[in-house]
């Protein structure tokens, strides 16, 4: 019994005067608490408690369940306890089998004795299977049994707790330890899509996968720089032990333009906090916005190739997409396919190859392309660059030599007069007239140009030439020229070609 | 013996907070899980989370996501249950129980939590 | 989560009836042959109250006439003889995983 200094308040006195008591099932329990301020008996086990005002406890028959804790309180708030263990062959252990373990933490196995006397008090795994070897527990009979750090590897662990009375083995009823991991990595979040385009009035609806060891993570859709509740619905799954996965399905049922923005899925653990996000753009229609990957005006030599190519972003899928020329439309000879695979490209490429074109083929192509909402189109003006043709060279009746030239770009007309029979023309003649006609041909095609000197200048044998050129080549007329007498006469003209 | 006391029925507007007390007494505060469960008007029953014994870890019911808070006062032997955001869908009886041996052993009387304009 | 379907829903019967409810889950509630289902009674206006604990396990001061079996997926509640203070709804709930659950209730009514 404890001992104090006079005057001060003492703890209360217990009768019978030890710390630990056995008695057997069926006996009296007798208990007497001496103290001039009594105010209570309490009675403890498996930390369930029951109280008494009376200053002396009596059990006439004690049981198993009597087993416990006696507590005498006084007025100042002293106490005084002894431990009554009731001995019952047929109940070793009072117990409460809710057992669960926080990774990492000790736990307590509720299987208090209630005769202390009985060995090896242990645990033992279920159906004779061996504990894991690396757990350890610390016994007390007054308690139960202390499991030290518990592993997330015991997780449903089966087990009893075990004492050894008169040589055999007696096991209390089964324990299944319930571990509750410790949080050591950040949830692992993904979203369905990382953007979405809707026209007003359509669903907008996407789901955040959150990935943890336990379904305490918490999760949450959050739109950015906004309070605004969102509706969330939730599915989730464990697969196995610490492998839980939640799916948050974010739903707005009729997307309106002020809908768009960042949507934010978070989640957290006591580890810490991960994010990922979608954007969602609402749009009042649809649109079609062309992009030329060339200039739209284009320059191409005569016999080769050229690929008209536009990317263009269309929302919602483009239906119809065709290439136009001369109000004639391409059957072949272009393609249409999406920029990206992925499921939310919006970017479509279209090319139209134009193989070893024609002066003749210059001119306006279209591409046009529509969807539900809206058409677009665009024009390339396409020139053929053409070496010079000289369609006619004659000597007009007014004594006029005439050289008409066509091509693309605009020819150059230079005149030329050699003497005798040089080969070389190389004093030049000034043109009297030089006109630009209007081609019968189609916008685009080659310029026609007319030039003309007058042949009375030439006053002896020889040959003149008429030089066609551009960008592209050169072509050359001639005009033999011969005197009889006073008589000038055009023998033959012939063209010569000048690569 | 064990008893668990809750605390009056509330009357809330939409979008405010509820706080549910549930004090216990009869054994040793620390040493159990308590659970919350509530119930709707002719509904069935519906467990949103539980405080474990120990640290105060909680685990709750995905379905009241960041709503719920649950938190114990060691020292008066009183849970707690805090519910947000409130809407006329949280209209309802909540109780306290209380885990022993695997089982809900031990329940409050409920509390009536009325969401009301 | 694991989800409990009572069946019947309500059930009328009359005092003396041997009355059977069944509960099914979604997946076992089993862990080492142990049925982490129990079963709970509860009147108009007052908290459940607890009757059979792992499946089979009559809580202490709850009669005899009640008792429980199954396992794995498919449990049963049975009252062998009715009494009258018997009329109440009766909830299966499994504790074998969180979320916990509870089935949607059978209401037994007076015939």
């Known amino acids: 019994q404890p001992s104090v200094s006079p005057g001060e308040p003492s703890p209360p006195s217990i009768h019978p005067g030890k710390s630990d008591l056995i008695v057997r099932v069926g006996d009296e329990i007798r208990l007497l608490c001496t103290d001039p301020g009594f105010v209570k008996w309490t009675f403890e086990i498996l930390d369930e408690t029951n109280e008494n005002k009376q200053n002396e406890w009596i059990t006439e028959k004690a049981e198993a369940t009597n087993t416990g804790k006696y507590t005498c309180t006084n007025k100042h708030g002293l106490s005084n306890s002894i431990y009554v263990f009731v001995r019952d062959p047929a109940k070793l252990f009072l117990v409460d089998r809710s057992l669960y373990g926080k990774e990492d933490n000790d736990t307590l196995v509720r299987c208090p004795l209630t005769d202390p006397e009985v060995t090896n008090y242990s645990l033992k795994g279920c159906q004779g299977k061996p504990l894991p070897k690396d757990l350890r527990f610390i016994p007390d009979p007054k308690a139960g049994i202390m499991i030290k750090s518990v592993k997330r590897a015991y997780h449903r662990l089966c087990l009893h707790c075990s004492v050894d009375q008169e040589g055999k083995s007696v096991l209390s009823e089964k324990f299944i330890l319930k571990v509750r991991p410790a949080f050591k990595a950040v949830p692992v979040v993904s979203v369905s899509k990382a953007s979405y385009l809707l026209r007003e009035g359509e669903e907008f609806t996407v789901t955040c996968t959150i990935k943890d060891v336990s379904s305490s993570v918490y999760s949450t859709w959050k739109r950015e720089n906004s309070q605004t509740k969102l509706q969330e619905k939730y599915n989730s799954w464990h697969h196995g032990d610490f492998n839980y996965e939640r799916q948050a399905t974010l739903t707005i049922s009729s997307a309106r333009v002020n809908d768009s923005g960042v949507f934010m899925c978070y989640a957290n653990n006591t580890f810490g906090s991960a994010n990922v996000t979608t954007t969602l753009e609402v749009v009042d229609k649809g649109f079609i916005n062309i992009f030329p990957m060339i200039n739209t005006t284009v320059f191409v030599n005569d016999g080769e190739n050229v690929d008209l190519i536009v990317e263009y972003e269309a929302f919602p899928k483009p239906e119809h997409q065709q290439w136009i020329y001369m109000n004639r439309t391409f059957t072949d000879k272009w393609e249409d396919y999406p920029k990206s695979e992925n499921e939310s490209n919006i970017r479509y490429v279209s090319e139209l190859h134009l193989t070893r074109l024609k002066g003749t083929e210059g001119g306006t192509y279209t591409f046009l392309v529509s969807n539900s909402d809206v058409n677009a189109a665009i024009a390339f003006n396409v020139y053929v660059n053409t070496k010079p043709e000289i369609l006619t060279y004659d000597r007009l009746v007014n004594g006029m030599l005439q050289c008409v030239a066509a091509g693309f770009p605009e020819p150059t007309i230079d005149w030329y007069f050699c003497p005798g029979t040089e080969q070389r023309c190389s004093a030049s003649v000034l043109p009297v007239d030089v006109q630009t006609l209007n081609s019968s041909g189609p916008p685009f095609g080659k310029l026609v140009v007319q030039s003309s000197i007058d042949s009375s200048a030439f006053k002896h044998n020889g040959t003149v030439e008429c030089k066609a050129y551009n960008d592209v080549g050169k072509t050359s007329a001639y005009f033999n020229f011969a005197f009889k007498g006073n008589n000038k006469e055009q023998i033959h003209p012939h063209t010569l070609f000048t690569p | 013996q064990v008893q668990l006391v809750q605390s009056g029925a509330e009357v809330k507007k939409p979008g405010a907070s509820v706080k549910v007390s549930c004090k216990a007494s009869?054994?040793?505060?620390?040493?159990?899980?308590m659970h919350w469960v509530r119930q709707a008007p002719g509904q069935g029953l519906e467990w949103m989370g539980v405080i474990y014994s120990g640290q105060g870890d909680t685990s709750y019911n995905q379905k009241f996501k960041g709503r719920v808070t649950m938190t114990t006062d060691t020292s008066t032997s009183t849970a707690y249950m805090e519910l947000r955001s409130l809407t006329s869908d949280d209209t309802a009886v909540y109780y306290c129980a209380r885990e022993r041996d695997t089982r809900f052993g031990n329940w409050g009387q409920g509390t009536l939590v009325t969401v009301s304009a | 989560e694991i989800v409990l379907t009572q069946s019947p829903s309500s059930l009328s019967a009359s005092v003396g009836d041997r009355v059977t409810i069944t509960c099914r889950a979604s997946e076992s509630v089993d862990i080492y042959g142990e049925s982490f289902m129990h079963w709970y009674q509860q009147k108009p206006g007052k908290a459940p109250k607890l009757l059979i604990y792992?499946?089979?396990n009559l809580e202490s001061g709850v009669p005899s006439r009640f008792s429980g079996s199954g396992s794995g997926t498919d449990f049963t509640l049975t009252i062998s003889s009715l009494q009258p203070e018997d009329f109440a709804t009766y909830y299966c709930?499994?504790?074998?995983?969180?979320?916990?659950?509870f089935g949607q209730g059978t209401k037994l009514e007076i015939k």
């Open positions: 009869g054994y040793t505060f620390t040493s159990y899980n």
């Open positions: 709930q499994q504790n074998r995983e969180e979320p916990y659950t």
């Open positions: 792992h499946a089979s």
